[in-house]
Interface confidence: medium
């Protein structure tokens, strides 16, 4: 095969948004629509990611950068670069093969994703349960029973944490 050879790699002159086309004597060709190259000197352009179905487009593809996806409402991203979308559940639930299921007694989930986790065992830290756990909230551990000796000042339970975005009543 005949080709003019130079000491410098001819592909190194190709900027981002182009590719060094092997089939065209290594000229710099623009990435065609729906493809991109994010760095210079590339031998190929990558096909743009398409955000279809449960994915929605967060950032459009350009000739120099890939599209970015997130998930439609009711789903959340999993994996690097939102490679998967997983169904949301309510707080106090976890996603199983059969759908969203309530957390078993003794476990909680305070998010719309992830699994139910066991309540904290306060006694392992020598503390007592100050506020009981629910399906949505972990227990709140308080001082150890020994700290509540006669004559000690009474403990005021902390105010419950407000949900983000809720204004005080």
């Amino acid at each position: 095969f005949e080709r003019t050879r130079s000491l410098q790699d001819p592909c190194s002159n190709c900027p981002a948004g182009t590719f060094c086309d092997n089939n065209r004597n290594q000229i710099c060709s623009p990435c065609p629509p729906n493809s991109f190259s994010s760095a210079g000197g590339q031998r190929t352009c990558d096909i743009c990611r398409q955000c279809k179905g449960v994915f929605r487009t967060r950032k459009e593809c350009s000739s120099t950068s890939n599209a970015e996806c997130d998930c439609t409402p009711g789903f959340h991203c999993l994996g690097a670069g939102c490679s998967m979308c997983e169904q949301d559940c309510k707080q106090g639930q976890e996603l199983t093969k059969k759908g969203c299921k309530d957390c078993c007694f003794g476990t909680f989930n305070d998010q719309k994703r992830g699994i139910c986790r066991p309540w904290t065992n306060c006694s392992l830290d020598g503390k007592s349960v100050l506020v009981n756990g629910t399906k949505e909230r972990d227990v709140v551990c308080g001082p150890s029973p020994a700290d509540l000796s006669p004559g000690a000042s009474s403990v005021t339970p902390p105010a419950p944490a407000r949900e983000p975005g809720h204004s005080p009543q």
Epitope: F1, R3, F19, C20, D21, N22, N23, R24, S29, C31, P32, S35, R43, T44, C45, D46, I47
Partner: antibody, heavy 123, light 107 residues
Amino acid sequence: QVQLVQSGAEVKKPGASVKVSCKASGYTFTSYWINWVRQAPGQGLEWMGNIYPSDSYTNYDQKFKDRVTMTRDTSTSTVYMELSSLRSEDTAVYYCTKSGEYGKIGYYAMDYWGQGTTVTVSS
Amino acid sequence: DIQMTQSPSSLSASVGDRVTITCRASQDISNYLNWYQQKPDKTVKLLIYYTSRLHSGVPSRFSGSGSGTDYTLTISSLQPEDIATYFCQQGNTLPYTFGQGTKLEIK
């Protein structure tokens, strides 16, 4: 579905020329490279060159560049390969192939192959 | 030109066997390596492109691996319909070049 249908077998005398056709269907003809690959009896595959139907840009292997001509007719979605000054060692099955692009533009794999055309060169 | 060397040139294996074919390039081909299957009736099909990606419709018992100059095609459990000659091909640099082929037969 993608199809590449080649012309029938040819018997030629040494010094003559042969022109093999390859009719494409089932995809956008002008958007993908067409290659020609040959296989001599009992031998491996040998890439001869390719053509981009949109603008007729061609690449030929150095071994064939003085004897091969690749052309296309976009009205019939057909590519032609003409090999001249035939000799006995040109006896082979000639394949046309479509180059697909997979995940990367500019990286080509021959994703569909014609059925092959047998060319026999004999005096 | 880049030379492609396949080994073995032929092999005989039993149904259910794991079969491995190797392909070595004379220089680094940056994973631009394709595998093709040529059946006894001379029809040719793409099996694997870009070293390890399965072409549509190809059974999952076929897989590819490798990098740099050394590449491998593996059939995890040989089937009777896999009787064929297998070719590697580099897509890194023109002219595109093929290995000499590996003829696979059933014992």
